[in-house]
């Protein structure tokens, strides 16, 4: 019987050209977390095995860091990274849970502000 | 090569033991989660128990929670299933099989060897 | 247990034939769903993994797609040596993995 809960950071922002911390956190049972994987919509970004550490997927390896703990750390975001991403965490006996977070990747305030104050 | 061969199959009773081998060959063995998969005579695929990389890790399907154990010896690049208090339900060709974070699906597969569980 | 049900549980087909083989999965899987192809007295070989990805050195006329409970494995051109069992596999519960009932692929 599954009885943890998955708790995220929810809907999330951040700036073009900055840095994310996608984080979930599994509560309320005792089954022995075997693995963790994020991904992207349906493709895979990262995985964290118990056993074998980190597995970051080749196509995201310059954007992508792993941590802190079982988090993601997303880098060099642009719009497209705009989405839904999900932390998937596999556990023995229990099964699979699954988090969401909705990011949102906005234009920097720099760009912003220099679009909206013109200096004369 | 990357290689699994399979050894230890034979004819038991029921109630009896069986201790069955699978040497790796070819590749970084510890680097790997390893996992024994049956087929019945005739039937098809089921897995039966995992373990991971270090050996840390066992899991196992209800099937055969409790009379199968998993191990490994990394120094010796081997994967072993102990067999213990085998049914007639038992009996079929186990198959030893590796994964690498089990996302990229079993990609070796050894020639298995047959378990005959019979009065 | 995420039950996995394969249809139909065997075909016939010709060389040449296009042939497709369907997945379903008792409850959403994402994409975390395997391919493998069984010839008589062999072991099973991966084809295709997580639904879409072409093991290395299967040839390019097997392709994998779906997402969720549905997934579908297509032979674009059935070649003499297709002929042979084909599973699916969950891998979403991890570590605990399951395979759908199989599909005999026959010659007509």
């Known amino acids: 019987m599954m009885t943890g809960t998955i708790e995220t950071t929810g809907n999330i922002s951040a700036e073009k050209g900055g840095s994310i911390i996608l984080q979930c956190h599994l509560s309320s049972t005792t089954a022995q977390v075997t693995q963790v994987n994020w991904e992207q919509q349906d493709q895979l970004l990262a995985i964290c095995n118990a056993d074998l550490g980190w597995h970051i997927s080749p196509s995201f390896k310059d954007r992508v860091a792993p941590g802190p703990g079982l988090g993601l750390t997303l880098q060099s975001l642009t719009v497209n990274d705009t989405g839904e991403y999900f932390c998937i965490y596999h556990t023995y006996p229990d099964g699979t849970y699954t988090g969401r977070i909705f990011l949102e990747v906005l234009e920097s305030s720099v760009a912003e502000h220099g679009a909206r104050f013109q200096i004369p | 090569e990357v290689q699994l061969l399979e050894s230890g199959g034979g004819l038991v009773q029921p109630g009896g033991s069986l201790r069955l081998s699978c040497a790796a060959s070819?590749?970084?063995?510890?680097?790997?989660?390893m996992s024994w998969v049956r087929q019945a005579p005739g039937k098809g695929l089921e897995w039966v128990s995992g373990?991971?990389?270090?050996?840390?890790?066992?899991y196992y399907a209800d099937s055969v929670k409790g009379r199968f154990t998993i191990s490994r010896d990394n120094s010796k690049n081997t994967l072993y299933l102990q067999m213990n208090s085998l049914r007639a339900e038992d009996t079929a060709v186990y198959y030893c099989?590796?994964?690498?974070?089990?996302?990229?699906?079993?990609?070796?597969w050894g020639q298995g060897t047959l378990v005959t569980v019979s009065s | 247990d995420i039950q996995m049900t394969q249809s139909p549980s065997s075909l016939s087909a010709s060389v040449g034939d296009r042939v497709t083989i369907t997945c379903r999965a008792g409850?959403?899987?994402?994409?975390?769903l395997n391919w493998y192809q069984q010839k008589p007295g062999k072991a099973p070989k991966l084809l295709i993994y997580?639904?879409?990805n072409l093991q290395s050195g299967v040839p390019s006329r097997f392709s994998g797609s779906g997402s969720g409970t549905d997934f579908t494995l297509t032979i674009s051109s059935l070649q003499p040596e297709d002929f042979a069992t084909y599973y699916c596999?969950?891998?979403?519960?991890?570590?605990?993995?399951?395979f759908g009932g199989g599909t005999k692929v026959e010659i007509k």
């Open positions: 070819g590749f970084m063995f510890s680097d790997y989660a």
């Open positions: 997580a639904s879409s």
């Open positions: 373990i991971s990389g270090s050996g840390g890790y066992t």
């Open positions: 596999q969950q891998s979403y519960s991890t570590p605990l993995l399951t």
């Open positions: 099989t590796r994964s690498w974070y089990y996302y990229y699906g079993m990609d070796v």
């Open positions: 409850q959403s899987i994402r994409s975390y």
